[in-house]
């Protein structure tokens, strides 16, 4: 990276807490907390299923798929009213992420 800042390189994130709840059948709820050092015009988001700094415009317009939140090979679709997104795996399994 052309410029480093503090312990976290500018534009990068690290996961500091993760929680999974598998108590419900056929459904796993995962929550993750990350620390990010985002540069001007960016905000913490998700890229390739990992915390990342993304353009603030994406969050503002709720064009979540522009973050490239899904893994390679998956398809991304916005949820109705842009409350989040789905990642569809080649086999048809769907992972849904809602933004709160």
């Amino acid at each position: 990276q052309f410029l480093k800042e503090g312990q976290l390189a500018a534009g990068t994130c690290e996961v500091i807490a993760a929680h999974r709840d598998s108590s419900q059948p056929r459904r796993t709820i995962a929550r993750q907390t990350a620390r990010c050092a985002c540069r001007k015009g960016q905000i913490a988001g998700t890229t390739r299923a990992r915390p990342a700094c993304v353009d603030a415009r994406i969050i503002k317009t709720k064009q979540w798929c522009d973050m490239l939140p899904c893994l390679e090979g998956e398809g991304c679709d916005l949820l109705i009213n842009r409350s989040g997104w789905t990642c569809t795996q080649p086999g048809g399994r769907i992972k849904t992420t809602t933004v709160s």
Epitope: F2, Q42, T47, A56, R57, Q63, C65, L68
Partner: antibody, heavy 113, light 110 residues
Amino acid sequence: QSLEESGGRLVTPGTPLTLTCTASGFSLSTYYMSWVRQAPGKGLEWIGIVYPSGTTYYANWAKGRFTISTASTTVDLMITSPTTEDTATYFCARGDSFGYGLWGPGTLVTVSS
Amino acid sequence: ELVLTQSPSVQVNLGQTVSLTCTADTLSRSYASWYQQKPGQAPVLLIYRDTSRPSGVPDRFSGSSSGNTATLTISGAQAGDEADYYCATSDGSGSNYQYVFGGGTQLTVT
């Protein structure tokens, strides 16, 4: 997974030309797609990018000269009013936060009167 | 607007190590990528995020970064490494997004 450009040909100055990049084996909804050109004997020149939402950005020098649009499996680049300086090989490239890891072989555009 | 400067040409002896540099005229907060292009072919991604190598790229190729300079190092240069090498980085965000290539370095292996 592959990309292939088409539409390159000899055109006269001022005649609009549309190039098409066809994607195979992956979904455009999970990548950024860019157009890059290379004049004969010169370096690479980024033209612009289209996000999965259809949002586009262009190099400062390319604004107003090019238009990028996308469909389900294709990304188009329109050269609105070609000049001789637009003679080049045009590449489409698939990118994400890790750089542009997949490129098409390129299509040659020659602008001449 | 960000400008990336590369030496136009560099020569290296077969089996030797060579470093190609890419200098930004202003400090950028974005990662550098490196591309290799052989005559008549499309570019190939060699290094992303300053130091990472895509699968399939030999570990003879490595990247580093310090200050406003990114460096591509080729250890044990081979005849097949003769090509043009381009550095690139994104510049700006939001409504001002740009992707910038350096002018390229032509590497000759003798």
